[in-house]
Interface confidence: medium
């Protein structure tokens, strides 16, 4: 039988009445145009909704927008358009919500053609009140908050000026001209690239990388011949043009650009690109595009310095620059990532790693599924996950894979079971162990979301017809109940729940259409009465993450330690609650050679865990060296994998070699850097 229709499925008692009492409809007095929704703060219940409607007239486009505010998680909304003087808000800038619980909001207004500058509306009290501020420039980008201080804002102007405010947008100062890209770093530092000759596009590859640590009082040039730059974790990356040709290389700094080292990565040509797929304070996943228009490249994983890279995955699907990749960090289990590869026959297959890119495998076939037509062998196939690429190809995939850090082990995704991704209508699959095993959860495409840290999963069928039914599960997707939330079906446009999956409220957005008009409508359902009681100790059970051999005491060791979690029992129908904290218990594992990667100048022969010195470093390999103030590299051949916490056990000791003589390169050297003050 289909999932959720088994005899064992216990029904939640009287759920229709409980949900009916907690279903709140709000009809927006708006013509249907576009709607955007933002949560202001964490656990505040404040939602801002901006609706915009464009009327194309013969000469120009007339626009109208309305702003609504809820402070009860979307159950009721109040029209607050008058707080922004009924001004038309530019949706391409969205609503700039301040970091953490600052309560800050910036809305960017549309202004008439001849005006001297733009206009913003600012709130620092969770959108209860707004202050109108006229800008001395026209913004090109959304206002960017400093992660450390929400009073500090930066923006680029349409004339490529870099503007900074120190008092939450009240007063602005242009700190630099001819700026292409600007980003906040740590400690209120700003990094930005500048052009000298004509424009950002014309000077690509000849840009300079600058840094200011005092909001524009003084500057330091930290790089030249820059193509682009990026920040990831504690790493600052720059792709730098080579002296002699049109290739470029990645350089990395861990001291805010004071010193640079060349990353041990292949150089790329004009048509290729680098992309930081994921980064944390320990390491980086870097994609390096293949030459030619192949649509794939190679994933490399870095050491703790961001310099030495190990090849992680070949033929990684990533279409042209800024294109689509399926690379997904499974946030519900440490070390797990999912992505797609383009096989030799041009089919797309899903791969998963459980050890932060050390090894990749296919996803295990769900036990309750048959292999589809793509499978050569009907008994042997894998699950393949639909993500960004499938969505971009307009396959019938309404949502990317979903995981939440506080819903431990749960991953939900659309997929097909065969030898490769299928273009047929997908089903929804769930894993409760971070991707090791999978079960078909729902037939056909659905929208889905996680509530109450995994205590409830909610889903809505993806359909071109109006809908009025929502499905929910209190046992991690094993059994499903259906609830009719309205008599009159609506054209569904999206599910909204508070980020972080701690809420028990879900908002269903859509529009009603009649002969004359169409209107936005939302239904907010509170599941608090379904989960009647708070969870107690007896409702949780111990779960060992990454367990593949339950009776072996090395079981679960990933990156040098294992973690045991308290997980809600599937049979328990209770509230984790908003204050739920994941209870995990780490224990250190002993080191084996698997806990080390090979340092520069060393490699692992196939099927061997030992690192062997490369016989010769010749040709372009000479450029793969460590630079900084000291121009030498000492190594014992091994380097602990970033984030690996193993202790004792194997301690690979090697003679320390000075590889100074083997290094030659040009790089972003300190003598090429200069400083200046305003």
């Amino acid at each position: 039988s289909a999932p959720g229709e088994d005899e064992e499925c216990g029904r939640v008692r009287d759920f229709v009445a409980k949900l009916a009492n907690n279903t709140h409809q709000h009809v927006f007095d708006d013509l249907r145009g576009s709607v955007s929704l933002s949560w202001v703060g964490d656990s505040t219940g404040v939602i801002l909704v901006l609706t915009t409607f464009h009327v194309p007239l013969v000469i120009m486009t007339f626009g109208q927008s309305k702003l609504y505010r809820s402070e009860d998680y979307g159950k009721n909304f109040k029209d607050i358009t008058d707080l922004i003087n009924n001004t038309f808000i530019r949706t391409e800038f969205g609503m700039a919500i301040g970091p953490e619980n600052s309560g800050k909001v910036v809305l960017t207004a549309e202004v008439s053609g001849g005006s001297r500058g733009g206009r913003i509306f600012r709130s620092s009290d969770f959108a209860k009140n707004f202050v109108q501020t006229d800008l001395p420039f026209h913004p090109l980008t959304q206002m960017m908050y400093s992660p450390q201080n929400s009073d500090y804002l930066l923006a680029l102007s349409t004339e490529n000026g870099l503007w900074v405010s120190k008092n939450f947008g009240g007063k602005w100062e242009e700190i630099h001209k001819a700026v292409c890209l600007a980003k906040w770093g740590s400690d209120n530092t700003i990094f930005f690239t500048t052009y000298a000759n004509g424009s950002c596009k014309a000077d690509l590859g000849a840009l300079e990388l600058w840094r200011t640590s005092d909001l524009g009082k003084s500057f330091k040039t930290i790089g030249v011949k820059i193509y682009s730059f990026g920040l990831g974790g504690r790493f600052l990356f720059a792709s730098v043009m080579a002296d002699k040709d049109t290739t470029r290389r990645i350089h990395v700094s861990t001291d805010q650009g004071d010193t640079w080292s060349m990353a041990q990565l292949p150089s790329v040509g004009q048509e290729q690109f680098y992309s930081i797929l994921a980064a944390n304070d320990d390491m980086v996943f870097m994609h390096v595009d293949e030459p030619g228009d192949t649509g794939f490249g190679t994933i490399f994983t870095s050491d703790d310095r961001g310099i030495v890279y190990s090849k992680s995955l070949d033929r990684h699907l990533y279409t042209t620059t800024g294109g689509e990749t399926d690379f997904t960090n499974v946030t519900s289990l440490r070390g797990v990532y999912i992505t797609s590869v383009l096989s030799e026959d041009n089919s797309i297959q899903t791969m998963i790693t459980f050890d932060q890119g050390g090894r990749w495998t296919h996803l295990r076939k769900p036990e309750n599924s048959e292999c589809d037509a793509t499978a050569k062998n009907k008994n042997e196939c894998s699950l393949h996950i639909h993500a960004s690429y499938s969505i971009s190809q307009k396959l019938n995939v309404p949502m990317a894979p979903l995981s939440e850090p506080n819903a431990v082990g749960i991953v939900i995704a659309h997929g097909s079971v065969g030898d490769a991704i299928s273009v047929m209508v997908p089903d929804v699959y769930i894993s409760d162990d971070g991707g090791y095993s999978w079960t078909k959860m729902l037939e056909g495409p659905h929208y889905y979301t996680i509530l109450d840290s995994g205590g409830i999963i909610v889903a809505i069928e993806h359909s071109s017809r109006p809908i009025n039914v929502i499905k929910f599960s209190t046992d991690e997707g094993q059994c499903w109940q259906t609830y009719t939330f309205t008599r009159d079906p609506i054209y569904f446009t999206g599910l909204a729940s508070e980020p972080g999956a701690r809420s028990m409220n879900i908002s269903i957005w859509g529009f009603t259409e009649s002969f004359l008009t169409s209107q936005w409508v939302s239904y907010t359902i509170d599941f608090k009465d379904i989960l009647e009681r708070n969870c107690e100790e007896k409702d949780y059970t111990i779960w060992l993450a990454h367990s593949t051999d339950p009776e072996d005491y090395e079981d679960g060791c990933i990156l040098g330690y294992k973690e045991q979690f308290l997980r809600l029992r599937k049979s328990s129908v209770c509230q984790n609650g908003r204050d739920y904290v994941v209870t995990k218990q780490p224990s250190i594992c002993l080191c084996s050679l698997e806990d080390f990667l090979c340092d520069f100048g060393y490699y692992r022969p196939e099927n061997d865990s030992k690192c062997v010195e490369q016989p010769e470093l010749k040709g372009h390999d000479l450029e793969f060296c460590l630079y900084g103030r000291e121009e030498h590299l000492t190594t014992n051949g091994y380097r602990k994998i970033p984030g690996d916490k193993c202790q004792g056990g194997v301690n690979p000791v090697r003679e320390v070699k000075d590889l100074k003589k083997k290094c030659t390169s040009n790089f972003l050297s300190p003598e090429k850097q200069n400083s200046k003050s305003n």
Epitope: S547, E551, Y553, Q564, Q585, S587, Q647
Partner: antibody, heavy 118, light 107 residues
Framework: EVQLVESGGGLVQPGGSLRLSCAAS????????MSWVRQAPGKGLEWVAI????????YYSDTVKGRFTISRDNSKNSLYLQMNSLRAEDTAVYYC???????????WGQGTLVTVSS | DIQMTQSPSSLSASVGDRVTITCHAS??????IGWLQQKPGKAFKGLIY???NLKDGVPSRFSGSGSGADFTLTISSLQPEDFATYFC?????????FGGGTKVEIR
Amino acid sequence: EVQLVESGGGLVQPGGSLRLSCAASGFTFSTYGMSWVRQAPGKGLEWVAIISSGGSYTYYSDTVKGRFTISRDNSKNSLYLQMNSLRAEDTAVYYCSRSSSHWYFDVWGQGTLVTVSS
Amino acid sequence: DIQMTQSPSSLSASVGDRVTITCHASQGISSNIGWLQQKPGKAFKGLIYHGTNLKDGVPSRFSGSGSGADFTLTISSLQPEDFATYFCVQYAQFPYTFGGGTKVEIR
């Protein structure tokens, strides 16, 4: 009934060797890690060595490393401790113990006495 | 190595008493602690693992608490068969280490 029975203890001279055995029954031996733990007369418990379920991993306390070897034969449901270069301070009751995925000493044998004396 | 300091080393109690034994780890071990029981002439018996989890078949009067470095074994109502020596053991990292033991005697 889950049971562990140690054997092979006895009197041995310093510098000598001894091989302890532990016979397991009542559970699937090949799926559990196994440990040796000892208790010297009038002293506390001291963990000696552990071996993984398949026998591919072994770990030792610093006091016995290089002198003792833990091994197992899953086809015979047996655990062994080969003790070489024995010292007077190795005198103790030696227990074998089962370790599940919780790295936990949940089942123990009755112990076998090893006396190292000239 | 992680030292496990167990106290008291011995105690006298009567049937029905509530008995508490503590174990302090020299560094944080999360909840990677077990409690063992030894009766004269009998094999050691595992009581509690991961600080708070009762092994199957162990009476519910035994309970464990604590996390980090300080842990407690509690017997809510002492029974005649509970007179024994109790040990804590840490398995957060090698080498595994044991507490010195607590002998529970009849008053």
